[in-house]
């Protein structure tokens, strides 16, 4: 039975040209995290394997930085980066947990962070 929950940064906003940290945290389970995949709709951004390190998709290599931790830093944001991002935790023995973050990239300088929320 999967008992874990993923806490994410929730709905966040950032300024065009700036950067943002996408962060998820898996709690309430003793399952071992083997890998975290970061995806944007139909695209793979990066993979962090707990033992083998990072894979950064070539189409994002100039704008994505690994970390902090299992998180991902998006740089040089554009309005096109607005949308849903998913952290997919591969765990043993539980299986897969998925967290969702919605990022809005704003033209203006008014960019406030949303509240944190949990996905069971």
């Amino acid at each position: 039975m999967m008992t874990g929950t993923i806490e994410t940064t929730g709905n966040i906003s950032a300024e065009k040209g700036g950067s943002i940290i996408l962060q998820c945290h898996l709690s309430s389970t003793t399952a071992q995290v083997t890998q975290v995949n970061w995806e944007q709709q139909d695209q793979l951004l990066a993979i962090c394997n707990a033992d083998l390190g990072w894979h950064i998709s070539p189409s994002f290599k100039d704008r994505v930085a690994p970390g902090p931790g299992l998180g991902l830093t998006l740089q040089s944001l554009t309005v096109n980066d607005t949308g849903e991002y998913f952290c997919i935790y591969h765990t043993y023995p539980d299986g897969t947990y998925t967290g969702r973050i919605f990022l809005e990239v704003l033209e203006s300088s008014v960019a406030e962070h949303g509240a944190r929320f949990q996905i069971p």
Partner: antibody
Framework: QVQLVQSGAEVKKPGASVKVSCKAS????????MHWVRQAPGQRLEWIGG????????SYSQKFQGRATLTVDTSASTAYMELSSLRSEDTAVYYC????????????WGQGTTVTVSS | DIQMTQSPSSLSASVGDRVTITCQAS??????LAWYQQKPGKAPKLLIY???YRYTGVPSRFSGSGSGTDFTFTISSLQPEDIATYYC?????????FGGGTKLEIK
């Protein structure tokens, strides 16, 4: 230039162990994970596992968990793969192969080491 | 484990032909796929990474495409030196797995 040079062919009896080495040169050894892939005669390539020389973390295919042991000697820029409790179906060519910097594709390969398990 | 199904398992083509090999993953792997060429008695060589990126020094006649579960590897104009077995490889999640290979022969 990047080179991965493996140890020579081995003939082992069933139940024995084998340890294959892979000497790396031409790059900073700790910056790339090292993987081991085998190929039995006429069969597809099969991933055994990988090791991150930087911190020693290992990832194994469940099929080889407990029977394969991956280690590195960073001072000698050498990776090792030991396979225990050998059986005839372990007869194969064993390759060490490096994953690209910040990518998981396998960009450089050793020449292969033939391991024959026969009574 | 993610299963990789490659087809055809073998094919015969003439020099100058356009050759297409397909690889199907048992689940969505996004673009976490590479293609390798292996000649008899030799180690595999990386040709394509992240589904569609040509590796350094690989001739432009080799290309890859696809995302999700369906991938294609193409040789636009077959050359005699392309005779080899070609493998796809997924690294979306461990254990990493390979296709069964496609053995390419000249007619």
């Amino acid at each position: 230039q990047v080179q991965l040079v493996q140890s020579g062919a081995e003939v082992k009896k069933p139940g024995a162990s084998v340890k294959v080495s892979c000497k790396a040169s031409g790059y900073t050894f700790t910056e790339n994970a090292m993987h081991w892939v085998r190929q039995a005669p006429g069969q597809r390539l099969e991933w055994i596992g990988g090791i991150n020389p930087n911190q020693g973390g290992t990832s194994y295919s469940q099929k080889f968990q407990g029977r394969a042991t991956l280690t590195v000697d960073t001072s000698a820029s050498t990776a090792y793969m030991e396979l225990s409790s050998l059986r005839s179906e372990d007869t194969a060519v064993y390759y060490c192969t490096r994953s690209s910097y910040y990518r998981y594709d396998l960009d450089y390969w050793g020449q292969g080491t033939t391991v024959t398990v026969s009574s | 484990d993610i299963q990789m199904t490659q087809s055809p398992s073998s094919l015969s083509a003439s020099v100058g032909d356009r050759v297409t090999i397909t690889c199907q993953a048992s689940q969505d792997i996004k673009t976490a796929l590479a293609w390798y060429q292996q000649k008899p008695g030799k180690a595999p060589k990386l040709l394509i990474y992240s589904a569609s990126y040509r590796y350094t020094g690989v001739p432009s006649r080799f290309s890859g495409s696809g995302s999700g579960t369906d991938f294609t590897f193409t040789i636009s104009s077959l050359q005699p030196e392309d005779i080899a077995t070609y493998y796809c490889h997924q690294h979306y999640t461990t254990p990493w797995t390979f296709g069964g290979g496609t053995k390419l022969e000249i007619k």
